[in-house]
């Protein structure tokens, strides 16, 4: 099938160090079907950024970007 | 722009453990993986393990019981050490830059390799 | 632990289009093997050119194209030029590790 060919973007491991809030433009959660929970932050330059989710930081943004949406 | 430099002793006696320094510029440690691969002459590569952002890591579980890979963030350098070495331990150890979403590349940039020899 | 094969050799005209297979002892490859094509040039240059199965990393030519053809990851040169002509390695992830195909010598005369 199409769907299964289509790469679904996981996160092998998470940055270390939070990213500056006013680099965030925007963010997706991964797939249920990656083997590990993630956040995509995409930044201001176009690059994307594996998060934890669990982090404090990670779900602030999260929920910034949501009011802000 | 995106370096990383491999330094190692280039001459090892057999049962003695090896030490490798890959030094990376251009990019942090904290949001990037490091890949470890060798390569024995005339032969292909061989992924020995990995070490992410928070210092996890992940080996070839032929070689897991000999293997261990760290780091320091501060002086943007990762460190293999393998110990017992033999003979078929000869080979190029190369050091890859490993971004962290399954859909880039994930041995992206690449050292240009330090030469291990194991010998007597 | 899994054995990744690959063609030992290859060879191809300028302009021709060849294709570089990459299969798993353990079963068909899938998207969640993350197939990554890596291409080595003399003096131990080595640059990552696909990865996730079928994107191309930054300034890779767009004649390079990953894909999963029957049970098996794939690389595609469309048009090879006399510069493609290398040593082609895949590797496939595991779950927790990494496992490389024995690569594919690409002769382009």
């Known amino acids: 099938s199409l769907a299964a060919d289509t790469p679904t973007a996981c996160c092998f491991s998470y940055t270390s160090r939070q990213i500056p809030q006013n680099f965030i433009a925007d963010y997706f959660e991964t797939s249920s079907q990656c083997s590990k929970p993630g956040v995509i932050f995409l930044t201001k330059r176009s690059r994307q950024v594996c998060a934890d989710p669990s982090e404090e930081w990670v779900q602030k943004y999260v929920s910034d970007l949501e009011l802000s949406a | 722009q995106v370096q990383l430099k491999e330094s190692g002793p280039g001459l090892v006696a057999p049962s003695q453990s090896l030490s490798i320094t890959c030094t990376v510029s251009g990019f942090s440690l904290t949001g990037y993986g490091i890949h470890w691969v060798r390569q024995p002459p005339g032969k292909g590569l061989e992924w020995l393990g990995v070490i992410w952002p928070g210092g996890g890591t992940n080996y070839n579980s032929a070689l897991m019981s000999r293997l261990n890979i760290s780091k320091d963030n501060s002086k943007s350098q990762v460190f293999l050490k393998m110990n017992s070495l033999q003979t078929d331990d000869t080979a190029m150890y190369y050091c890859a830059r490993g971004p962290l979403i399954t859909t880039e590349v994930s041995m992206d940039y690449w050292g240009q390799g330090t030469s291990v020899t194991v010998s007597s | 632990q899994a054995v990744v094969t690959q063609e030992s050799a290859l060879t191809t005209s300028p302009g021709e289009t060849v294709t570089l297979t990459c299969r798993s002892n353990?079963?068909?490859?899938?998207?969640?093997?993350?197939a990554n094509w890596v291409q080595e040039k003399p003096d131990h240059l080595f640059t990552g050119l696909i990865g996730g199965t079928n994107n191309r990393a930054p300034g890779v030519p767009a004649r390079f194209s990953g894909s999963l053809i029957g049970d098996k990851a794939a690389l595609t040169i469309t048009g090879a030029q006399t510069e493609d002509e290398a040593i082609y390695f895949c590797a496939l992830w595991y779950s927790n590790h990494w496992v490389f195909g024995g690569g594919t010598k690409l002769t382009v005369l």
């Open positions: 353990t079963g068909a490859v899938t998207t969640s093997n993350y």
